[in-house]
Interface confidence: medium
Amino acid sequence: SQVSQNCHNGSYEISVLMMGNSAFAEPLKNLEDAVNEGLEIVRGRLQNAGLNVTVNATFMYSDGLIHNSGDCRSSTCEGLDLLRKISNAQRMGCVLIGPSCTYSTFQMYLDTELSYPMISAGSFGLSCDYKETLTRLMSPARKLMYFLVNFWKTNDLPFKTYSWSTSYVYKNGTETEDCFWYLNALEASVSYFSHELGFKVVLRQDKEFQDILMDHNRKSNVIIMCGGPEFLYKLKGDRAVAEDIVIILVDLFNDQYFEDNVTAPDYMKNVLVLTLSPGNSLLNSSFSRNLSPTKRDFALAYLNGILLFGHMLKIFLENGENITTPKFAHAFRNLTFEGYDGPVTLDDWGDVDSTMVLLYTSVDTKKYKVLLTYDTHVNKTYPVDMSPTFTWKNSKLPNDITGRGPQ
């Protein structure tokens, strides 16, 4: 049935899906706070621009009786049930914010006549790439993949003089939603990462991972995994590690590495951590104070989703254009808007661009130090520390093939 959009005559509504199954286990109250904070800012910005309009959010909750796993496993049906709820109420906003699970976003996109924009804090999987009316405000798997290929091929830096073409990927099935889809993308045989590598094997058992650390017959020195330092320690413990091993720990949504009092534990010395550059002042931003470091990014994405809508609404109203058109639905891409903690850039496909940071543990100071940064928007690496105090021989990253270390 045709659902009317509450999106005209000076009144603009945002439909926010509050799903029990979510990419991060964030209390819905915190997400509500994020949305309300965003609404205040949007209203102020519109008012200051001389646009006397009303902007509100409707929070759509699922009953939670059937879909109560809490993670993303039963999110497909929950998302569709919420859409049905909207349809039955004959009430849809100008924009849909949520869902965050890849399964539900993919299915909802497939099963609906999307004449309105969809903004997601999550939907990390490759199956949500290149969707015309979907905007993703947390780094999707495609961005990670492009960094890894770029870094593997790099061979002209003082600390990386070899191109790599091999890798192990550790994936045991207990990952968080973001990690699950990041590793899924690396595992997929048709993905860009797999296409560019000559050798890639997925390690699914703890023992497989542990054996590789000292296996003289290993096919690669490089192991990619996803999670925090504690996750690595549970797996690796204090086991001895061959000197040529490089572990790439993907931990994008964790800015604890940048806090002043953080010391890197000894088991992190063979590890390069890939994370996101913290916003200019994210660590002392008032909004993020009562959120954990990981969930900060999730709630922030909801807030930025509201600000993005406000940004587009302002442009269309100032140009005298209609909001309930395919043009509006397709406009949430290839732009930069003022986010809560600084400018936010979206690529041609509506996916957020960011600065990824590769950290190493300094053997001198036992602190995490920035080795290089990578701008996802231009697919370019920028070295930061030209003389890193690595654990690896000659302060250079080893070759990825055993027995051909730095010469």
Epitope: N36, E40, G44, G279, S286, G342
Partner: nanobody
Framework: EVQLVESGGGLVKPGGSLRLSCAAS????????MGWFRQAPGKEREFVSS????????YYADSVKGRFTISRDNAKNSLYLQMNSLRAEDTAVYYC??????????????WGQGTMVTVSS
Amino acid sequence: EVQLVESGGGLVKPGGSLRLSCAASGRTSTIHRMGWFRQAPGKEREFVSSISRVSSTTYYADSVKGRFTISRDNAKNSLYLQMNSLRAEDTAVYYCAASEYEVSPGKSKYWGQGTMVTVSS
């Protein structure tokens, strides 16, 4: 342009109380969020508390939760920080800060000159 002027600092004994005020003037209609930061001698400036203009949503640093209360009076364009159960480690210069709708509220655009709070017996 917005100007911020703090007052109310001083010397107080541990366990005592103080109330800081911040008067805002200028283009105050553009202000979204106001807050307090502090800087102890030899340390970096740190977030203390903030409050939004419309809904008065508040945030506090863990170190002051339950002891400090932030409030604002929009009619008077003023911000307040009620500080109870003061400790020696609360000694610092306290700065009033404000950010506009047009800038990122995570970053404060306007700052006061600061008022000194000393907690000592």
